[in-house]
């Protein structure tokens, strides 16, 4: 969490951002909140990115002002206009690109004063894994698949029954480049699976951590998946 305060002259206002991550090809949110003003027309929101000459986005006098917007963000940004009055300056970024990663500044001017806060935005790809029983004539195996990851993640298997066991010798993980030549499909196979046990396939890179759990019994197979973004720090 980054909390920024205003500077000289007018009073300072508190601006708060949260470090976040964007999933390549999907829409992302750059979070920023500020002390609200009574009049929308008195609020100016400017989003800037370190190393980029033009603005990422500008909102003033109740509407978007995009004449100074940098080409790389053209047609891809929007604020939540109806929420600005209550202090929400968050930016929606469409079709997140790898190159969108970096340091952003949320700069606010209101009748009460000015303020800004920085935000670290990471980009990559992350997806929910699906774990299934794979069958071949010799033995049962578990297959953990996740369609989109970048950068290349690590994959670790764990078991409820054999806690602390190292499954690297009885598992095999492969990474297959997807058609857009950036993200990769993750496939990990675990051999010598025993029934009445819960197994977890954990996929992690510096952006996200995902877990696929499977409990295999004779009468049913229970599955659940979780995805957690890492380093979501507020400023």
């Amino acid at each position: 969490l980054i909390i920024g305060f205003g500077i000289s002259g007018r009073h300072s206002i508190t601006v708060t951002t949260v470090a976040s991550a964007g999933n390549i090809g999907e829409d992302g949110i750059l979070s920023c909140t500020f002390e609200p003003d009574i009049k929308l027309s008195d609020i100016v929101i400017q989003w800037l990115k370190e190393g980029v000459l033009g603005l990422v986005h500008e909102f003033k006098e109740g509407k978007d002002e995009l004449s100074e917007q940098d080409e790389m963000f053209r047609g891809r940004t929007a604020v939540f206009a109806d929420q600005v009055i209550v202090g929400n300056a968050s930016l929606r970024l469409k079709n997140v690109q790898l190159t969108d990663a970096g340091t952003y500044k949320c700069y606010i001017i209101t009748s009460k004063g000015k303020g800004n806060a920085n935000l670290e935005y990471k980009t990559g790809a992350f997806s929910m894994p699906e774990v299934n029983v794979d069958y071949n004539a010799s033995s049962e195996t578990l297959r953990c698949e996740a369609p989109r990851w970048f950068p290349q993640p690590t994959v670790v298997w764990a078991s409820q029954v054999d806690q602390g066991a190292n499954f690297s010798e009885v598992s095999n993980t492969s990474f297959e480049l997807n058609s857009e030549n950036v993200t990769m499909k993750v496939v990990s196979v675990l051999y010598n699976v025993t029934i009445n046990n819960t197994y977890s396939c954990m996929i992690e890179n510096d952006i996200a951590k995902a877990t696929g759990d499977i409990k295999v019994t004779e009468s049913e197979i229970k599955r659940r998946s979780h995805l957690q973004l890492l380093n979501s720090k507020a400023s």
Partner: antibody, heavy 114, light 107 residues
């Protein structure tokens, strides 16, 4: 003994929503997942999804994601399935079944008609 | 999705007969297969799970076999109350899928 009780029939208009119930008894509700299955007239069975009543974790059949919403009320040991923006294609018998699908409700016949 | 196929949609047999209903999966599902009985009034009951395990309260005349992709349900001595439609279902992979059903009738 294990029982899953469902209303016999529901009649709703096209475009409307309906919330089907499945009241359970005879076992610990939160210890077993609940499944929902659809059967169109004269057709076979289609699995809609499953919900873990202990924490409301859900696995949907992608075909029904966005159409069906599964919920539970632990206090009354009841599972629900809401179907929205109904069309004639939704006219079917809907069953709830306790995981591992060992006990089934009698089914609710949903008729979507103006 | 895994396709489950019951090639025989209806089957006619005499009381006392040994009846076999088959089911095949489009890919290997190990032994993760259930058999259900649906009576004409719509009541559904689990007969067999994990290919060959008899569910509690199910008569021993019902048995199941198979592994991988090919499975069968056998009724050794057909009784009047066995007149129903029988469905196989795989639970190896989401979404769980059912066969089209085999309707059993008396000659």
């Amino acid at each position: 003994q294990v029982q899953l009780r469902q209303p016999g029939a529901e009649l709703v208009k096209p475009g409307a929503s309906v919330k089907l119930s499945c009241k359970t008894s005879g076992y610990t509700f939160t210890s077993y997942w609940m499944h929902w299955v659809k059967q169109r007239p004269g057709q076979g069975l289609e699995w809609i999804g499953e919900i873990d009543p202990s924490d409301s974790y859900i696995n949907y059949n992608q075909k029904f994601k966005g159409e069906a919403t599964l919920t539970v009320d632990k206090s009354s040991s009841t599972a629900y399935m809401q179907l929205s923006s109904l069309t004639s294609e939704d006219s079917a018998v809907y069953y709830c079944a306790r995981g591992p699908r060992d006990y089934w409700g009698q089914g609710t016949t949903l008729t979507v008609s103006s | 999705d895994i396709q489950m196929t019951q090639t025989t949609s209806s089957l006619s047999a005499s009381l006392g007969d040994r009846v076999t209903i088959s089911c095949s999966a489009s890919q290997g599902i190990s032994n993760y297969l259930n058999w259900y009985q649906q009576k004409p009034d719509g009541t559904v009951k689990l007969l067999i799970y994990y290919t060959s395990r008899l569910h509690s309260g199910v008569p021993s005349r019902f048995s199941g076999s198979g592994s991988g992709t090919d499975f069968s349900l056998t009724i050794s001595n057909l009784e009047p109350e066995d007149i129903a439609t029988y469905y196989c279902q795989q639970y190896s992979k989401l979404p769980y899928t059912f066969g089209g059903g085999t309707k059993l009738e008396v000659k």
